[in-house]
């Protein structure tokens, strides 16, 4: 015969632990139910009654199954120079991230401790790896046959246009110039953009910074902004 399923509260067998989503109450000496995310323990269990859970109040949350007497307070509202990427709900804390054009160079458990501007690749260099909320842009030199003529944190190296007759050959920072006869193949006008990191897509009331220099970091241990890559703007 299968073992009977015990309903909370119940006394565990000696040497055994309580089941998933249960906790051992020292006072009652029983296995009792935890409260689900978004709730907290309003009344602790006894030998005869299980935990009584209640919903978290406004601006408080619990993210895990728990038996805490009070929900945790959500962090303070994001300041005007940050973007709220996760709202405060009964089940999760609010998360504030850096404003558009910046990334988190030193993170904390929820949010950011230090924001730094996204590196911009100078002409002759394109974006090899786009910036994210927590990592800087990586620049790379434009390979032969490609160019970038912008200072940008999003533009990649683009192929030179192919001319029937070349007036001026292209280089890493300039497209080829064709003679008046039209080129056999031409790139669509305008720079090619990489998708922006999540934080730079957020709506924001503050003016968007457009960094023109990379953070000129000096001695830096892990988690700080990476030093400027070759081809980034800066000193």
């Amino acid at each position: 015969l299968p073992a009977q399923v015990a309903f909370t509260p119940y006394a565990p067998e000696p040497g055994s632990t309580c089941r998933l989503r249960e906790y051992y109450d020292q006072t009652a000496q029983m296995c009792c139910s935890k409260c689900s995310p978004g709730q907290h323990a309003k009344v602790f269990c006894t030998k005869t009654s299980d935990t009584v859970c209640d919903s978290c109040e406004d601006s408080t949350y619990t993210q895990l199954w728990n038996w805490v007497p009070e929900c945790l307070s959500c962090g303070s509202r994001c300041s005007s120079d940050q973007v709220e990427t996760q709202a405060c709900t009964r089940e999760q804390n609010r998360i504030c991230t850096c404003r558009p054009g910046w990334y988190c160079a030193l993170s904390k458990q929820e949010g950011c401790r230090l924001c730094a501007p996204l590196r911009k690749c100078r002409p002759g260099f394109g974006v090899a790896r786009p910036g994210t909320e927590t990592s800087d842009v990586v620049c790379k030199p434009c390979a032969p046959g490609t160019f970038s003529n912008t200072t940008s944190s999003t533009d990649i190296c683009r192929p030179h246009q192919i001319c029937n007759v070349v007036a001026i050959p292209g280089n890493a920072s300039m497209d080829a110039v064709c003679t008046s006869t039209s080129p056999t193949r031409s790139m669509a006008p305008g720079a090619v953009h990489l998708p922006q990191p999540v934080s730079t897509r957020s709506q924001h009331t503050q003016p968007t910074p457009e960094p023109s220099t990379a953070p000129s970091t000096s001695f830096l241990l892990p988690m700080g902004p990476s030093p400027p890559a070759e081809g980034s703007t800066g000193d």
């Epitope: 030193l106 401790r113 230090l114 924001c115 501007p117 000129s216």
Partner: antibody, heavy 119, light 107 residues
Framework: QVQLVQSGAEVKKPGASVKVSCKAS????????IHWVRQATGQGLEWMGW????????NYNEKFKDRVTMTRNTSISTAYMELSSLRSEDTAVYYC????????????WGQGTTVTVSS | DIVMTQSPDSLAVSLGERATINCKAS??????VAWYQQKPGQPPKLLIY???TRHTGVPDRFSGSGSGTDFTLTISSLQAEDVAVYYC?????????FGQGTKLEIK
């Protein structure tokens, strides 16, 4: 309320080292970056670097990186800035400062520590 | 390093009049500029950040403007307690640098 209280004035000889302390209160010490800024007499302000007490992350101004060491004692919520190979031009008021959010404008400052380098 | 250059070095303005201090960055710092007020024997006090956002408790006679490389701090109606040295600082990237300061006096 947030307070940064610095150690007292120091007089040092050229070539010596000085260690300035900055005791933090009113917030969780390991949650905020501490910066050091100096001001020579009658001169402007000069950023020396930052130090994060929570994980020992450091970023020194290139100008000082060979001579400056920033450390901390978490148990007493105190940050330290040591400057070695002192010269007369290091005579200045040294401030610790912190910023509330993730951008580096300083909303809290220590009262300053005067360091005089003289033979 | 980004050099912040303030003008003028000193300024005398009559009480109730407007005072304007300029700050020029050697390269684009977007809008990442802060302004501080410093009185003798005291540490600097934050007035404005992100070019134009007033810090908590700062009177609304203080305002900031600009972007890119040119920035301005304006005191719309000078009060006696505004006599101090004013510094701009870019909070863009390391190393964070300050202007040389502008001494504001009463005419």
């Amino acid at each position: 309320q947030v307070q940064l209280v610095q150690s007292g004035a120091e007089v040092k000889k050229p070539g010596a080292s000085v260690k300035v302390s900055c005791k933090a209160s009113g917030y969780t010490f390991t949650e905020s970056i501490i910066h050091w800024v100096r001001q020579a007499t009658g001169q402007g302000l000069e950023w020396m670097g930052w130090f994060y007490p929570g994980s020992d992350n450091i970023n020194y101004n290139e100008k000082f990186k060979d001579r400056v060491t920033m450390t901390r004692n978490t148990s007493i919520s105190t940050a330290y800035m040591e400057l070695s190979s002192l010269r007369s031009e290091d005579t200045a008021v040294y401030y610790c400062a912190r910023h509330e959010g993730p951008y580096v404008y300083f909303d809290y400052w220590g009262q300053g520590t005067t360091v005089t380098v003289s033979s | 390093d980004i050099v912040m250059t303030q003008s003028p070095d000193s300024l005398a303005v009559s009480l109730g009049e407007r005072a304007t201090i300029n700050c020029k960055a050697s390269q684009d710092v977007s809008t990442a500029v802060a302004w501080y007020q410093q009185k003798p024997g005291q540490p600097p006090k934050l007035l404005i950040y992100w070019t134009s956002t007033r810090h908590t408790g700062v009177p609304d006679r203080f305002s900031g403007s600009g972007s890119g490389t040119d920035f301005t701090l304006t005191i719309s109606s000078l009060q006696a307690e505004d006599v101090a040295v004013y510094y701009c600082q870019h909070h863009y990237s390391t190393p964070y640098t300050f202007g040389q300061g502008t001494k504001l006096e009463i005419k």
